[in-house]
């Protein structure tokens, strides 16, 4: 753990045994701010999360300090350590003086909290724009302009073919100066990103003359994710859903190639559904088979009476906040025409069950049930648009017996989570629990899928 | 027959609190999700939050958050609603209202109401 | 928050006529719309709910119809007794919000 951030873990002897943030309320962080004000957002930089905690549940609650003397809850937050945490505050209207972030997780580390005010915030009204300044190594003459005004480029003449040069930006708000950002180098006569040309011994993936991302070619020069970039110039293009199969998207593009099965295993669709809350807007049948090409995964999405019902089953019987104060359960069977070993589930989704008003991610628990109606658990599984179709590999415990799997199980407790497929994924020509069934003098045959007698030859 | 009778009128000075009650009876209260809704005078109504009265979890409005204190007492069937940091514009007629089965719902909606409690806030 | 937008805000009509109400939410809110009526110095009463559901004791002349954003209220023949107030309420989301209500009066 770091000297700059904080962790319920960083008061203590590192060969001592760590405390633990006893739940309901856990351990506490209370921060104050310099000057009390109306906030618009609050955002907090974490540094680490246990992987225990699954990014929900690690901070399970943060209170707003009023100057009034309330306390207002936030409730529990996911917190990921790739992007900071902003919540939204629209509707405090009172002074807040300071934060108390909650975590059951005793090695969570929080790196810094910002409080933003609300526009026109008296306290604001000296504030002057910022500028910057380019630093450089080697240093920039004397007399060159290096503080940057109301425009933002700054072009250097001064340079060697072959040099090194190193660039940082420092950012000035009245007197103060901030820290430098990260360096870019750049080696003069040689590529860059953004000069159209690939520099793959650079990192660079693509490269289209600019710093945008969400274009296909991100900020870095890497290819972002559904596009694919051709030329250089790149010319980048949104490939996902445009019908066209091409080799690179067989294994991601579902709406282009269909479902991909990797060679050597079965995919197997339901052939038939029961569910736990079903009406004629919400019949569990359509689960049945292989999901719907055309069907794309959304999130944060709150009325799903629109044209989901057809692809997918969802609990419409039930509002969200109504299965929230309830803490209802709703919960998914899926049948299998073959019982199999299963080497997999693959479950597909239409929406992940995210709340507009929220961060939480909605999780599913999922059971193999066999053809011994044993249940055999798979355990919890975080549900996101950004990883569907949700593959859960089936780890078999090899000092037990080899079962086949005639039905999954899969419960969850947001009405907002939308299912369009179960498929259960077996080994083509291969079934663990005949191979166990073979006699002394049989082996088994991946072609009859049976033990058949074999004689040695001498 | 499934009814819920609230405490009486209050006066009270800008800056206090005030604890409304709400007694359930002909029903299983704990059973049941309850509902608090305010009516300003002349104005819609407006929800302020509600409680599972089983488990005592709450949800209110983030317009009230931080003022409005919903709890239960199982053992007489009752719900409460404190709402603190009174200012006039808190003047209303504040209604307790009973929400779905919280085991099989098979109706939505608030379809009991308390007849209302008036609270007046003056200095 | 979801805003609900009533219409029209009055409307006079007469023993037996035929009374429509809308309710529009600014997003969709799938099925989960109730209407309440309330009459001066009492506290509303549901009519209908999920959209389209009658509750029970309620008479059939009130019926509801409706998903997503748009939301109607009928009243098929309107006796001495409907005179009063209607509101829409959501119950799809936090927080619950009421639209501004519509006065059925006496022509």
């Known amino acids: 753990s770091s000297v700059r951030t904080w962790s319920p873990n960083s008061a203590v002897n590192p060969h001592t045994v760590p405390p633990a943030c006893p739940e309901p309320q856990g351990c506490y962080l209370e921060l104050e701010f310099l000057y009390p004000l109306v906030p618009e957002s609050l955002t907090i930089w974490v540094t680490f999360v246990s992987t225990d905690w699954d990014s929900s549940g690690a901070v399970n609650d943060i209170k707003l300090l009023a100057v009034s003397g309330k306390n207002i809850s936030l409730g529990p937050q996911n917190v990921f350590c790739d992007v900071p945490l902003t919540i939204r505050l629209w509707d405090v209207g009172e002074e807040v003086y300071g934060i108390q972030i909650y975590t059951l997780d005793e090695h969570l580390e929080i790196d810094a909290a910002m409080l933003t005010s609300t526009a026109d915030t008296p306290l604001c009204l000296q504030c002057k724009p910022l500028k910057y300044k380019v630093v450089r190594d080697p240093p920039l003459q004397m007399d060159v302009a290096s503080i940057l005004h109301l425009n933002r480029k700054f072009v250097d003449m001064d340079l060697n073919l072959g040099s090194v040069y190193q660039y940082w930006v420092i950012t000035i708000s009245g007197t103060e100066e901030s820290e430098p950002s990260p360096a870019v180098t750049y080696i003069h006569g040689s590529g860059y990103c953004g000069d159209g040309i690939i520099q793959k011994d650079q990192g660079e993936q693509c490269d289209d003359m600019n710093k945008i991302n969400g274009d296909g070619c991100s900020l870095f020069c890497r290819q972002e994710v559904s596009f694919n970039c051709i030329d250089e110039p790149s010319r980048c293009y949104f490939h996902d859903g445009d019908g066209v199969c091409e080799e690179f998207e067989q294994k991601t593009s579902i709406k282009d190639c269909g479902v991909y099965t990797p060679q050597g295993f079965l995919d197997q669709w339901a052939s038939n559904a029961s569910v736990s809350h079903q009406d004629q807007q919400c019949p569990g049948w359509v689960i049945i088979g292989q999901p719907a090409a055309s069907q794309v995964c959304r999130t944060k999405v709150i009325d799903l009476s629109e044209g989901i019902s057809q692809h997918a089953w969802y609990p419409c019987t039930i509002s969200y906040p109504y299965s929230q104060l309830a803490q209802t359960t709703f919960w998914l069977r899926a049948y299998f025409s073959q019982p199999m070993v299963a080497a997999a589930v693959i479950v597909h989704l239409v929406t992940d069950g995210t709340y507009y008003g929220d961060q939480k991610q909605e999780t599913i628990s999922v059971q193999l049930l066999d053809t011994k109606d044993q249940s055999h658990d798979l355990g919890l599984h975080v549900l996101s648009c950004r990883n569907n179709p949700l593959i859960i590999p089936v780890v078999h415990d090899l000092s037990q017996p080899f079962y086949h799997s005639q039905a999954v199980r899969v419960s969850f407790s947001s009405p907002l989570v939308a299912i369009s497929g179960v498929a259960l994924r077996s080994f083509d020509n291969f079934d663990p629990v005949t191979l166990s069934s073979c006699q002394r003098g049989e082996t088994y045959s991946p072609a009859e899928q049976s033990c058949v007698h074999f004689a040695c030859e001498k | 027959q499934v009814q819920l009778v609230q405490s009486g009128a209050e006066v009270k000075k800008p800056g206090a609190s005030v604890k409304v009650s709400c007694k359930a009876s002909?029903?299983?209260?704990?059973?049941?999700?309850m509902h608090w809704v305010r009516q300003a005078p002349g104005q819609r109504l407006e929800w302020m939050g509600w409680?599972?009265?089983?488990?005592?979890?709450?949800k209110s409005s983030q317009k009230f958050q931080g003022r409005v204190t919903i709890t239960r007492d199982t053992s007489a069937s009752t719900a409460y609603m404190e709402l603190s940091s009174l200012r006039s514009e808190d003047t209303a007629v504040y209604y307790c209202?009973?929400?779905?089965?919280?085991?099989?719902?098979?109706?939505?909606?608030?379809?009991?109401w308390g007849q209302g409690t008036t609270v007046t806030v003056s200095s | 928050d979801i805003q609900m937008t009533q219409s029209p805000s009055s409307v006079s009509a007469s023993v037996g006529d035929r009374v429509t109400i809308t309710c529009r939410a600014s997003?969709?809110?799938?099925?989960?719309l109730a209407w309440y009526q309330q009459k001066p110095g009492k506290a509303p009463k549901l009519l209908i709910y999920a959209a389209s559901s009658l509750q029970s004791g309620v008479p059939s002349r009130f019926s509801g119809s409706g998903s997503g954003t748009d939301f109607t209220l009928t009243i098929s023949s309107l006796q001495p007794e409907d005179f009063a107030t209607y509101y829409c309420q959501q119950e799809n989301a936090y927080p619950f919000t009421f639209g501004g209500g519509t006065k059925v009066e006496i022509k």
């Open positions: 409680m599972n009265a089983g488990t005592g979890a709450t």
């Open positions: 209202a009973r929400g779905p089965s919280l085991e099989t719902p098979t109706t939505f909606g608030m379809d009991v």
């Open positions: 997003q969709g809110i799938s099925r989960w």
């Open positions: 002909g029903y299983t209260f704990t059973s049941y999700a």
